[in-house]
Interface confidence: medium
């Protein structure tokens, strides 16, 4: 007869990751014995919540309950009804949250509020839900990536797990593209990080890291339209801006005050004498990336070198795991594979942003023309990003990989977030016996979350 | 092809007014911001006024705020500077162009048309 | 109001030469600078915009960049037809203003 296999013994966590342009839910497993190893941690779902980001439900927090449910169900479906109690869920807001909160605290409490009380109705034990750093989103997110690459393994394998892997115990940095917010994080070459706020110090498996961060807020993809727009109008004094980062033949309407309603605008905000003004593309990459730079500062840095706006950044080092939008974006544009040097992507984009408006909806017919319009200012914005806000070079961007997952988990700020609120990455190297929790990573960024 | 074409110069006493015209045919006219500047004999050119597509938005030059006025008739593909209170220092050969951010500021401009301020 | 100073007001050349036309700007105008061509009895001809960017049809000869506040006009090798009135303008605000203008004559 056939044996009946064991139960499981395996550990679920939740994190909801709060982004700007939406929420997206994603469930973990691991088994229980092991859960100081590293690499164990793997991604078994993710559930993506219909509907823009929670910041939007500000005037409307009375929907954000039916918002939640499709993908709280989701969870309670996969992960077995016996686990739900001890299963925590977390939920991260990152730039779009950020932004809200520099508008109004109040309003910004008051989404969250309604957030943790639609949470805490769940059967699983919800930590709470709160607005993570800039900085925190960075370091969880290269926490994720190495987790994942197997950097923190002690265990050199002679087989590689995904392609881009290097038989070295050399970490990636981590560069993440958000709607709101850009972050990159990585450890430079023996270089003092001279601005201690983009500094960040581990111990992780018992492995020092000085480790540089920096977010830059208002400079994700959408915040990053949304500025050039709004320096754009300025000089147009026309109801009509000719831009360069739609294709020819695009036309939309935008309303001024959508324009100024982001924090993000303000510093080009003037009195307009139109209420609206409408976009006309005319699809060209050199204009469009010009005009892209212009929003990049570079005439100031108190440092030996700056990244943009006197932001210090030390020179690149390494591999980079380029993640989030910076992948779903050169995915689209079938720009992710290791063999496209910086000079073809820039070629592909020059073409790609110059063909006619209605050829690319012909193409592209199942793609939301809303987001379908924004892929040449996004592959556009990348590139800008890369080159002159991070100073990568046609060479250097060799090392850069675009990456969607790794071993089937989502690269992104959720899983590192997760491992360190679970205490599941020790400070030293994993003994045979558990060890106490004073031995764990505690970086400055550790917040203890309230139970409901 | 894009045509700018003045008309309405002449010579007028100070103090008198005199209505500018130009047509322009080549493009589409209701999409484009137009510009008048002026050129003073054996001077530089001098920016005079500007108005947007859809007449929302007129600016003008401190020399000549509040006696020019900017119009135009998007039905009629014309441009119009009226010069009220005419003085000496107006006397000028002024041009329209044309003015359509991001590639088409100023872009294309008319001949001319001459106007001579004497009593 | 934004200053343009146009230099040098008119230059000698002749065929063949390089020839520099440049204009300071009083305050910050992002690269939103154009470089005109008069010449007597004909339609002004704009040659460059966005600070750098050439007219489609304009001779690779002509090209303009932009260091700091100052914006040059470049002629790399002077031709008979090139002889003719420039000037710059900026559009980054109101009023727009003019540089003084730079007549390039035979030498």
């Known amino acids: 007869t056939q044996n009946k296999a064991l139960p499981e013994n395996v550990k679920y966590g939740i994190v909801l990751d709060a982004g700007s342009s939406h929420t997206s839910l994603y469930i973990y497993k691991w088994p229980a014995e092991k859960e100081n190893d590293t690499g164990v941690v793997h991604q078994v779902e993710e559930c993506r919540v219909k509907g823009p980001g929670i910041s939007k439900f500000v005037q409307k927090v009375n929907e954000i309950g039916i918002y939640l449910t499709d993908c709280m169900e989701r969870a309670r479906e996969v992960i077995p009804r016996s686990q739900h109690q001890e299963t925590p869920v977390y939920l991260g807001a990152t730039a779009g949250m950020r932004l809200l909160r520099m508008e109004s605290e109040e309003l910004a409490d008051r989404v969250l509020d309604v957030v943790e009380r639609s949470l805490s109705n769940y059967p699983f034990d919800f930590q709470g839900a709160r607005i993570i750093t800039g900085q925190e989103e960075g370091a969880y997110g290269w926490i994720t990536i190495n987790y994942l690459l197997g950097k923190f393994s002690q265990k050199t394998r002679w087989f590689s797990i995904v392609p881009y892997e290097t038989n070295n115990q050399e970490t990636f940095g981590a560069l993440d593209l958000g709607g709101a917010s850009t972050q990159v994080t990585f450890v430079p070459q023996n270089q003092t990080i001279e601005s201690p706020d983009n500094a960040l110090q581990f111990r992780l498996y018992g492995k020092d890291y000085n480790v540089y961060t920096h977010s830059f807020l208002c400079y994700g993809k959408d915040q990053a339209l949304w500025q050039k727009l709004a320096k754009d109008i300025q000089v147009a004094s026309n109801e009509i801006l000719r831009d360069p980062c739609f294709h020819p033949g695009y036309k939309k309407v935008v309303n001024v005050s959508d324009l100024y309603k982001t924090p993000c605008t303000k510093r080009f905000e003037m009195t307009l004498p139109f209420q609206q003004f409408e976009i006309q593309g005319i699809g060209n990459y050199q204009q469009c990336h010009q005009s892209i730079l212009e929003l990049f500062n570079t005439s100031y840095c108190p440092y030996s070198q700056c990244a943009f706006n006197g932001i210090f950044l030390p020179p690149l080092q390494g591999d980079f795991g380029a993640f989030s939008a910076f992948y779903f974006v050169m995915k689209f544009l079938n720009l992710t594979s290791e063999k496209v040097s910086q000079e073809k992507v820039t070629e592909m984009m020059k073409k790609f942003c110059a063909q006619p408006w209605e050829e690319i909806k012909t193409s592209y017919a199942g793609v939301k023309e809303k987001y379908l319009s924004e892929y040449c200012f996004s592959g556009t914005y990348i590139l800008s990003l890369l080159l002159q806000g991070y100073h990568f070079t046609a060479d250097s961007w060799e090392h850069i990989h675009f990456i969607g997952k790794i071993q089937g988990s989502d690269a992104g700020w959720t899983l590192g977030y997760m491992l360190n609120l679970t205490n599941m990455i020790p400070a030293e190297q994993p003994l045979s016996t558990p060890l106490s929790h004073s031995t764990y990573v505690a970086h400055h960024h550790h917040h203890h979350h309230h139970h409901h | 092809q894009v045509q700018l074409v003045e008309s309405g110069g002449g010579v007028v006493q100070p103090g008198r007014s005199l209505r500018l015209s130009c047509a322009a045919s080549?493009?589409?006219?209701?999409?484009?911001?137009m510009h008048w500047v002026r050129q003073a004999p054996g001077k530089g050119l001098e920016w005079v006024a500007y108005?947007?597509?859809?007449?929302?938005?007129?600016y003008y030059a401190d020399t000549v705020k509040g006696r020019f006025t900017i119009s135009r008739d998007n039905s009629k593909n014309t441009l119009y500077l009226q010069m009220n209170s005419l003085r000496a220092e107006d006397t000028a050969v002024y041009y329209c162009?044309?003015?359509?951010?991001?590639?088409?500021?100023?872009?294309?401009w008319g001949q001319g048309t001459t106007v001579t301020v004497s009593s | 109001d934004i200053q343009m100073t146009q230099s040098p007001s008119s230059l000698s050349a002749s065929v063949g030469d390089r020839v520099t036309i440049t204009c300071r700007a009083s305050q910050e105008i992002r690269g939103y600078l154009i470089w005109l061509q008069q010449k007597p009895g004909k339609a002004i001809k704009r040659l460059i915009y966005a600070a750098s960017t050439l007219e489609s049809g304009v001779p690779s000869r002509f090209s303009g960049s932009r260091s700091g506040s100052d914006y040059t006009l470049t002629i790399s090798s002077l031709q008979p037809e090139d002889f003719a009135t420039y000037y710059c303008?900026?559009?980054?605000?109101?009023?727009?203003?003019f540089g003084q203008g730079t007549k390039v004559e035979i030498k």
């Open positions: 303008l900026q559009y980054t605000s109101y009023p727009r203003t």
């Open positions: 108005i947007s597509s859809g007449s929302s938005i007129m």
């Open positions: 162009a044309r003015d359509l951010y991001y590639d088409h500021v100023l872009d294309y």
């Open positions: 080549g493009f589409t006219f209701s999409d484009y911001g």
